[in-house]
């Protein structure tokens, strides 16, 4: 069986139609189309809830950029 020893990749079948405030977001991960039916972004909120979002939407791209910058900027 392929990749049987690897944890299964979670998939998204629907995307949220609500913009999520960046203050509520803790992290994200990308899901590629070779592993799942849809390319997706999964945001994890500060209360550890996971939400599927459409990577083609501007607010999703902006939120990823924001989280990337947060990660790159060391907190003092």
């Amino acid at each position: 069986q392929p990749d049987a020893i690897n944890a299964p990749v979670t998939c998204c079948y629907n995307f949220t139609n609500r913009k999520i405030s960046v203050q509520r977001l803790a992290s994200y991960r990308r899901i590629t189309s070779s592993k799942c039916p849809k390319e997706a972004v999964i945001f994890k909120t500060i209360v550890a809830k996971e939400i599927c979002a459409d990577p083609k939407q501007k607010w999703v791209q902006d939120s990823m950029d924001h989280l990337d910058k947060q990660t790159q900027t060391p907190k003092t």
């Epitope: 299964p8 979670t10 998939c11 998204c12 079948y13 949220t16 809830k49 996971e50 599927c52």
Partner: nanobody, 125 residues
């Protein structure tokens, strides 16, 4: 746990057709998505097609759109992959897999964690 058994693979000439079947047992499948994946020698496994058990929404990889059709028979707990206009590059081991949906519409699923043993499809030119 979900048990999946594929059948229907074989050797076919380019341009020909095959129908793969995946018989599922062990669960009530209403909250599952059933998928077909394939893995060619030396390549990564790739998504081919999927269908929601409840509602029947379908999803396809771009490489098979218009050529492959996924369907299900709820009474038989079986998912089918009708493959037409086959090409040599479709040669691979085809796997059936099951994915449990999240609790809400926008939650990610559990992932394709249950797999069949695979069935070989060879397309000769």
């Amino acid at each position: 746990e979900v048990q999946l058994v594929e059948s229907g693979g074989g050797l076919v000439q380019a341009g020909g057709s095959l129908r793969l079947s995946c018989a599922a047992s062990g669960r009530t499948f209403s909250s599952y998505v059933m998928g077909w994946f394939r893995q060619a020698p030396g390549k990564e496994r790739e998504f081919v097609a999927a269908i929601r058990w409840s509602g029947g929404s379908t999803y396809y990889a771009d490489s098979v759109k218009g050529r492959f059709t996924i369907s299900r028979d709820n009474a038989k707990n079986t998912v089918y992959l009708q493959m037409n206009s086959l090409k040599p590059e479709d040669t691979a081991v085809y796997y059936c897999a099951a994915d449990l949906l999240g609790d809400s519409d926008y939650e990610p699923s559990s992932g394709f964690g249950s797999w069949g043993q695979g069935t070989q499809v060879t397309v000769s030119s």
